[in-house]
C-alpha cells in the first residue's frame, strides 16, 4: 500500500513497541532513476537492515531501555555506487511497555530533621529508578508514605512529595516534633509506576529512619537598651545561633533606616554599634538571617526586638513663644481661661515627661497680684479672684515655669480681656436655595458663599464666626472655611461627590463663636441656614479591584486550564464585558462575563515569564467606557527542553598521527530553569560502535571530556555521537554530534587544502 508501507526516499519516523518479535517490514523505499540500490547506515545495532531493493526491516525484538531511538540514514545509490539521493534520516522510536519495576536506590535511608523545620521543605529524598520511559505512565513514579512509627493521635508528622520523593514535615510535624518526647521515627515508603494510578503498576518499598534534633535557631527575648549610653561601643546586646557551625550571619533592616545601629558577627553575637536616641526611635525590629556558604538562607529569619529605654534628657518646651487667651469681662471665679500645654520629648506617661506648671509672675499686678491660678499638672488657667474690667486692664502677661524632674522652662502667656459674648451670629439668609453640581466637580472647588454677622467686639473670640455642617453630609464631603476679617464662609468640596450614594443632600449650617455665650443667651434659628445640593450623574468607567492581577501556573498546564481571573465593577451598576489586549503569543482567552482567564495554547516559560497582558473592562450599554488593568502570569518551570551543545564546536582536531590518547572539553546546556543546584547533565557515547574508540567522562554538571581510547586513527573526519541526559523530571535526553578531524599539522595547526582553513585549534594534545 503506497504511502503507509512504501514510497519514495524522504525523512521518516517509525514507532515500534519494544519486545515485539519482528512480524512485518517497516517500509519499502522506491528508487527514482538513476538510483538502483539503497544503503543503510547509523545506529543499526545489527538489528535494522535494508535489502538492496529498498526493503527496510528489523531482525529481532527491540529493547527501549537499551536504545530508545535508533537514528538511521538511508541513501539511494546509482549503479556505480554513487549516492544520488540522501542520505535521509530515518528515525525509529522504540515505544515503551511496562517491562521494568521501580527500584529504590537504597533498601534503607537515614536522615535527620530539626524540630520546627519549615513544613514542606524536604530534608531527605528517597529515590527510585524505573528503566521504563519516564514520558509514559510506565516510567512515572509515585511515592507514598505507607507507615509512620510512632503515630501519635493518628497525626502524620511527615509527608512525601509523590513526584520528587522529597520527605518533609507537615504543619503538625513542624509544630509538635520534640526530640525530648520522641527522638526517632521510622517511615515505610512505597513507590509505584504507572503514576500510582493503575492496578497493574509495579511497586517497591524502602525504610526510612529519621532522627529528630533540637532546633536552637530561635528568636531571643526582646532586648532593652538605655538611650545615650556612654559605655564603649559596640556593646553585645543578644545572640542567635544556627544549629550547625559554619553559618554566615547577617542582619536585615526591613525598615530601611538611614542609620542602622546594629551588627552581627560570625558567632551570631548581635551588637549595638552606637548610642541610641529614644526620641529619634524608641524601638527597633530587625531580622537575623543565617545562610550557607553559597549565600542561601538556611531557615526563616529571626525577629529581633530592641526597646530603647528613656532617660530624662529633654527639657519641657512651650507650645509657642507667647500663648494668647481671651477672657470675658464678666467671667466668674474658677472659670477656665485656657490650657497651656507644654511638651516633653521624653517617654510619655513616665516621670521623665511628667510636667509641673507654676505661675512665677503676673504683670501688671492690677488691681492685685494673684488674679490667676494654674493647675499644677493639667496646665489649665483659671480666674482666681474677682471679675476683670477691660477699661482698667485690657491685657495681662503671665510667666509660667514648666518643669520635669530635672529641667525647668519658662513659658509666656498673654491674656486679653474682652467684652462679654452676648450677641449670637445671625445668618443674612436662612435658605441658600438649590445648587446642582456634576459628581465629577473638582475637590477643593468653592461651591457657595455664606455670611453671618455678630455684633460683639470685633476681632475677638466673641465675634469670630465658625461655620459647621450639622446635617445632610454624613460622609464629610463638604467643609466651610472662614475669612477671619469678614467672617465670610466659603463652602468647599473636601471629598468627591457621588451621585450613586447621595443624589440629593439637604444641608444645614450652624454659625458659632469660639468664646462661650454669656449665661442666659443661647443660639437660636438665626444662627442656622440651609441649602439643597443636587448631584448629577457622570458616567464613570468600570473600576478594577486591583491595578495588577497576578497568577502562577506550571508551564505544562493543559490547554483550557483556568489560570486566573479578574474582577471589575461599574459605578453605575452596568454589566461589564472583559477582553484581553496585548496577548502577543495567543496563549490566553478571557470569559467576557466572569473575567476568568484560560489557557488556549501550550505555555512556555522559556519564551518569557511573567507573561504580561492587559485586561480591559468595558461597560455593556451606556457610553461603553472602559478601563485597563494588568494581568501577570508567572510560569513555573517544567523540564521540557532537551540538552544541547552550548555552542557550535567547529574545527575540533587532533594532529595525526596521535602520539598519545588526546581529549577535548565540551559544554552542554538547555533552556530550562535550574534553581539552586544548576544543571546536572550526564554524558555517554551514543553508539556502541564508537565506544571502542572514544570515551566521555563528566567533569561537572555542564562540562564533559571526550577522549580517544587509543592512538590508531585514520587521517579523516570522525563524527562522534554523544548522548546527554538532563536528569530532570521527566529526564530529557538528546544525541549531539561532535565532528573531530585527524589531520596533518603545520605551524598554524591543522593542514587542510585551500578553501577550508580551520580556526585556531581549540584542542591541546
Amino acid at each position: 500500500q503506497e504511502g503507509k508501507f512504501s514510497g519514495p526516499l524522504k525523512p521518516m519516523t517509525f514507532s515500534i513497541y519494544e519486545g515485539q518479535e519482528p512480524s512485518q517490514i517497516i517500509f519499502q523505499f522506491k528508487a527514482n532513476p538513476p538510483a538502483v540500490t539503497f544503503e543503510l547506515t547509523g545506529e543499526t545495532d545489527n538489528i535494522f537492515k535494508i535489502e538492496r531493493e529498498g526493503l527496510l526491516y528489523y531482525t529481532k525484538a527491540l529493547d527501549r531501555e537499551t536504545r530508545s531511538t535508533h537514528n538511521l540514514q538511508v541513501a539511494a545509490l546509482d549503479a556505480n555506487g554513487a549516492i544520488v539521493e540522501g542520505p535521509v534520516p530515518i528515525t525509529i522510536e522504540v515505544k515503551d511497555v511496562n517491562d521494568n519495576r521501580p527500584t529504590f536506590l537504597q533498601s534503607k535511608y537515614e536522615g535527620s530533621v530539626r524540630q520546627n523545620s519549615r513544613p514542606g521543605k524536604p530534608f531527605l529524598y528517597v529515590n527510585a529508578t524505573d528503566l521504563d520511559d519516564p514520558a509514559t505512565p510506565n516510567g512515572q513514579l509515585s511515592y507514598q508514605i505507607v507507615i509512620q512509627l510512632p503515630m501519635i493521635n493518628n497525626v502524620m508528622y511527615f509527608q512525601i512529595n509523590n513526584k520528587t520523593g522529597g520527605i518533609s514535615l507537615t504543619r503538625e510535624g513542624s509544630q509538635e516534633l520534640n526530640p525530648a518526647k520522641n527522638p526517632s521515627y521510622n517511615l515505610v515508603i512505597s513507590v509505584k509506576d504507572m503514576g500510582g494510578q493503575s492496578e497493574n503498576s509495579f511497586s517497591d518499598t524502602t525504610s526510612v529512619d529519621i532522627i529528630v534534633t533540637e532546633n536552637i535557631w530561635k528568636a531571643p527575648e526582646p532586648v532593652e537598651m538605655v538611650e545615650n549610653s556612654t559605655d564603649p561601643h559596640p556593646i553585645k546586646i543578644t545572640q542567635v545561633r544556627w544549629n550547625d557551625p559554619g553559618a554566615q550571619y547577617s542582619l536585615v533592616d526591613k525598615e530601611k533606616l538611614p542609620r542602622f545601629p546594629f551588627s552581627i558577627d560570625q558567632e551570631g553575637d548581635i551588637y549595638v554599634t552606637q548610642p541610641l536616641d529614644r526620641e529619634e526611635k524608641d524601638a527597633y525590629v530587625f531580622y537575623a538571617v543565617a545562610k550557607d556558604e553559597y549565600g542561601k538562607p538556611l531557615s526563616y529569619p529571626l525577629e529581633i526586638h530592641v526597646k530603647v529605654q528613656d532617660i530624662n534628657d529633654n527639657p519641657p518646651t512651650c507650645p509657642s513663644p507667647v500663648t494668647v487667651f481671651e477672657v470675658q469681662e464678666n467671667e466668674r471665679l474658677g472659670n477656665s481661661i485656657g490650657t497651656l500645654t507644654a511638651h516633653d520629648s521624653d517617654e510619655e506617661n513616665t516621670a521623665n515627661s511628667l510636667l509641673n506648671y507654676r505661675i512665677v509672675e503676673q504683670t501688671p499686678k492690677l488691681p492685685m497680684d494673684g488674679l490667676f491660678l494654674i493647675q499644677t499638672y493639667a496646665g489649665m488657667l483659671q480666674l482666681a479672684k474677682q471679675s476683670l474690667k477691660k477699661q482698667d486692664t485690657p491685657q495681662y502677661n503671665l510667666t509660667i515655669e514648666v518643669s520635669d524632674k530635672d529641667f525647668k522652662t519658662l513659658c509666656f502667656v498673654q491674656i486679653n480681656v474682652i467684652d462679654i459674648n452676648d450677641q449670637i451670629p445671625i445668618f443674612e439668609k436662612s435658605d441658600y436655595g438649590n445648587l446642582t453640581l456634576a459628581e465629577d466637580t473638582n475637590v477643593g472647588s468653592t461651591i457657595l458663599t455664606i455670611q453671618a454677622t455678630d455684633a460683639d467686639e470685633p476681632f475677638t473670640g466673641s465675634s469670630k464666626i465658625l461655620y459647621h455642617v450639622i446635617k445632610g453630609d454624613s460622609e464629610g464631603r463638604l467643609g466651610v472655611d472662614t475669612d477671619p476679617h469678614t467672617n465670610t464662609g466659603y463652602v468647599i468640596i473636601k471629598k468627591p461627590l457621588d451621585f450613586e450614594t447621595a443624589a440629593i443632600s439637604n444641608i444645614v449650617f450652624k454659625a458659632e463663636n469660639p468664646e462661650p455665650l454669656v449665661f442666659g443667651v443661647t443660639y437660636n434659628a438665626s444662627s442656622f441656614a440651609k441649602f439643597t445640593l443636587f448631584v448629577t450623574d457622570v458616567n464613570e468607567a468600570p473600576e478594577f479591584s486591583q491595578y495588577v492581577f497576578q497568577a502562577k501556573v506550571s508551564e505544562d498546564v493543559a490547554i483550557g486550564t483556568k489560570v486566573g481571573n479578574v474582577t471589575a465593577k461599574d459605578p453605575e451598576g452596568l454589566d461589564i464585558s472583559y477582553s484581553l489586549r496585548g496577548d502577543t503569543r495567543g496563549w490566553l482567552k478571557i470569559d467576557h462575563v466572569t473575567g476568568e482567564i484560560f489557557s488556549v495554547a501550550p505555555l512556555d516559560r522559556e519564551a518569557g515569564s511573567p507573561y504580561r497582558v492587559q485586561v480591559v473592562a468595558t461597560e455593556v450599554g451606556g457610553s461603553s467606557l472602559s478601563s485597563v488593568s494588568q494581568f501577570h502570569l508567572i510560569l513555573t518551570d517544567v523540564n521540557d527542553n532537551p540538552p544541547r551543545l552550548a555552542k557550535d564546536y567547529m574545527d575540533l582536531y587532533f594532529c595525526h598521527p596521535l602520539s598519545a590518547p588526546g581529549s577535548l572539553i565540551f559544554e552542554a546546556t538547555d533552556d530550562d530553569q535550574h534553581l539552586f543546584r544548576g544543571p546536572h547533565f550526564t554524558f555517554s557515547i551514543a553508539s556502541e560502535s564508537l565506544q571502542n574508540d572514544w570515551q566521555v567522562s563528566k567533569i561537572n554538571g555542564t562540562h564533559a571530556r571526550l577522549s580517544t581510547r587509543h592512538t590508531d586513527f585514520e587521517e579523516k573526519e570522525y563524527v562522534v555521537s554523544i548522548r546527554i541526559n538532563d536528569g530532570g523530571r521527566p529526564p530529557l535526553e538528546s544525541t549531539v554530534s561532535l565532528t573531530v578531524t585527524f589531520c596533518s599539522c603545520g605551524e598554524d595547526g591543522c593542514f587542510r587544502p585551500a578553501g577550508h582553513q580551520p580556526g585556531i585549534p581549540t584542542v591541546g594534545m
Epitope: V36, T37, R52, A79, N80, G81, E714, E717
Partner: antibody, heavy 122, light 108 residues
Framework: QVQLVQSGAEVKKPGSSVKISCKVS????????IHWMRQAPGQGLEWIGY????????VYAQKFQGRATLTADKSTSTAYMELSSLRSEDTAVYYC???????????????WGQGTTLTVSS | DIQMTQSPSSLSASVGDRVTITCRVS???????LHWYQQKPGKAPKPLIY???TLASGVPSRFSGSGSGTDYTLTISSLQPEDFATYYC?????????FGQGTKLEIK
C-alpha cells in the same frame, strides 16, 4: 571469461558523426554499467559517461552533454557511443569499460575494451 | 569537477629501485574511491589498485597504495622490467569521474 570487444578504427571528416560499438560477453549485460573514456594522443584519460542497460539510465559528463549519445542493445549485449559534430580535437582512442556488479561495494574499472582509434581530419 | 594532480609527470628509475608516485585530489574524498591503473603503449589501461590500497586481481605484491583525504601514493618496492609503463590515478567519488594526467615510468 569477461570480454569487451570494440569496433575497428574510424577516420571521419570534421562535422560528421561516428558510432563506436562495444560488444560484451562472459557476464550478464544488464547487471553492470558500461562507461566510455577517451585518450587523445600522448594525453591522459577523459571520462565521457555511462549507461546502465538494465534501466536505460544514461549519465554524461557535462563536456559531452548533447554531443555524445550512449545506447545499448540488450538483445546483442552491445553498447554504443555516438559522437556528433566531430572536430579535429576528438581524435583519440575511445575505450569502453565496466565496473563490478552494481550490488558491489568496490567500484573501479575492472575490465576494458581494447580501444577504438578515431581520427578526425579533413 | 574534482582535479587530480600526479607527480612526477615522468620518472626514470632502474630495475630494483623503490618508486613512489603521488596523487593529490582537489577535495577530500573517501579512500575507498581512489584507484590506480597501469597502461602500456598501445594497450588499454588495466586495474592495479582499487580503494587506495587493495591490489586488483593478478597484481604482484610489490605494488602498494596508501593515503587518505586529499593525498594518495602508489609505491613499487622493487622495480621489475615489466613495470615500465604509465600510471594513472582516478577518483570514483563525484561525477564526472576524473583521472590524473599520468606518470610515465621509464628505464634509466
Amino acid at each position: 571469461q569477461v570480454q569487451l570487444v570494440q569496433s575497428g578504427a574510424e577516420v571521419k571528416k570534421p562535422g560528421s558523426s561516428v558510432k563506436i560499438s562495444c560488444k560484451v560477453s562472459g557476464y550478464t549485460f544488464t547487471d553492470h554499467t558500461i562507461h566510455w573514456m577517451r585518450q587523445a594522443p600522448g594525453q591522459g584519460l577523459e571520462w565521457i559517461g555511462y549507461i546502465f542497460p538494465r534501466d536505460d539510465i544514461v549519465v554524461y559528463a557535462q563536456k559531452f552533454q548533447g554531443r555524445a549519445t550512449l545506447t545499448a542493445d540488450k538483445s546483442t549485449s552491445t553498447a554504443y557511443m555516438e559522437l556528433s559534430s566531430l572536430r579535429s580535437e576528438d581524435t583519440a582512442v575511445y575505450y569502453c569499460a565496466r565496473p563490478p556488479y552494481y550490488y558491489s561495494r568496490n567500484f573501479y574499472f575492472d575490465y576494458w575494451g581494447q580501444g577504438t582509434t578515431l581520427t578526425v581530419s579533413s | 569537477d574534482i582535479q587530480m594532480t600526479q607527480s612526477p609527470s615522468s620518472l626514470s628509475a632502474s630495475v630494483g629501485d623503490r618508486v613512489t608516485i603521488t596523487c593529490r585530489v582537489s577535495s577530500i574524498i573517501s579512500s575507498s574511491k581512489l584507484h590506480w591503473y597501469q597502461q602500456k603503449p598501445g594497450k588499454a589501461p588495466k586495474p592495479l589498485i582499487y580503494g587506495t590500497s587493495t591490489l586488483a586481481s593478478g597484481v604482484p605484491s610489490r605494488f602498494s597504495g596508501s593515503g587518505s583525504g586529499t593525498d594518495y601514493t602508489l609505491t613499487i618496492s622493487s622495480l621489475q622490467p615489466e613495470d615500465f609503463a604509465t600510471y594513472y590515478c582516478q577518483q570514483w567519488s563525484n561525477y564526472p569521474f576524473t583521472f590524473g594526467q599520468g606518470t610515465k615510468l621509464e628505464i634509466k
